[in-house]
């Protein structure tokens, strides 16, 4: 039982929140201010992620669990927990290199990320325009030409919403 | 590790210059678009100018047009700010950010910031 308890590493008794410490003897050491272990049996302690700049803290960093960080107002998270932060822009806008810029004629945004879309096509629906597109929206598409004529009725349920991103091919 | 340290803010006068400085550490600032932000008191951060890897591309926010450069020095891997012509509604922290991995092609996001330098233009 000696035998197998000399060979057991030590450091794996060591909790989360604590380091094994190589200069004392392999014993458990909190982690020092700043840095942390969120497993244990870790022979260092990570240095807390800073949220600064364009970062701003969400959750604090604790002995055992990093920080974790979202954007200041005026910008938005990208990326795997928030690795980075990209400008916000008005909705009518798009984001480009040389920062925001408005929507192309024929073209829309209805949220402060993400690019201009090509207005919908009706008439690839055979339905007409009800009501026009603007930079912040995307045009209504009515009833066909057809659907108007004298005795038939105004009212047709609306085309199909496009995905995210698709523009009429 | 990776760090970005401003300097060269201070108070000046309506009208007057100053000129932020960016350090850059444990990257190499000639791989990445540079970036300064900047944000007013009670206000949200806003993007100022960017400057691409060697340069040659300079893009501003309309209101600093004609009045604010960015330029960069990659040997000394650092980032500049001059400002001229400053105003009242130029006071605020400013910020200095690298563009992340993909800046320009995939997204505009900015993966590391400073802890920024304050500018109070005041008489």
């Known amino acids: 039982f000696e035998r197998t308890r000399s060979l057991q590493d030590p450091c794996s008794n060591c909790p989360a929140g604590t380091f094994c410490d190589n200069n004392r003897n392999q014993i458990c050491s909190p982690c020092p201010p700043n840095s942390f272990s969120s497993a244990g049996g870790q022979r260092t302690c990570d240095i807390c992620r800073q949220c600064k700049g364009v970062f701003r803290t969400r959750k604090e960093c604790s002995s055992t669990s990093n920080a974790e960080c979202d954007c200041t107002p005026g910008f938005h998270c990208l990326g795997a927990g928030c690795s980075m932060c990209e400008q916000d822009c008005k909705q009518g806008q798009e984001l480009t290199k040389k920062g925001c810029k408005d929507c192309c004629f024929g073209t829309f945004n209805d949220q402060k990320r993400g690019i201009c879309r090509p207005w919908t096509n009706c008439s690839l629906d055979g339905k007409s325009v009800l009501v026009n597109g603007t930079k912040e929206r995307d045009v209504v598409c009515g009833p066909s030409p057809a659907d108007l004529s004298p005795g038939a009725s105004s009212v047709t349920p609306p085309a199909p919403a496009r995905e995210p991103g698709h523009s009429p091919q | 590790e990776v760090q970005l340290v401003e300097s060269g803010g201070g108070l000046v006068q309506p009208g007057g210059s100053l000129r932020l400085s960016c350090a850059a550490t444990?990257?190499?600032?000639?791989n990445y678009w540079m970036n300064w932000v900047r944000q007013a008191p009670g206000k949200g951060l806003e993007w100022v100018a960017n400057i691409n890897q060697d340069g040659s591309e300079r893009y501003y926010v309309d209101s600093v047009k004609g009045r604010f450069t960015i330029s960069r020095d990659n040997a000394k891997n650092s980032l500049y700010l001059q400002m001229s012509s400053l105003r009242a509604e130029d006071t605020a922290v400013y910020y200095c950010a690298r563009g992340g991995e993909g800046y320009g092609v995939d997204h505009y996001g900015l993966d590391v910031s400073g802890q920024g330098t304050t500018v109070t233009v005041s008489s």
């Open positions: 444990g990257f190499t600032l000639s």
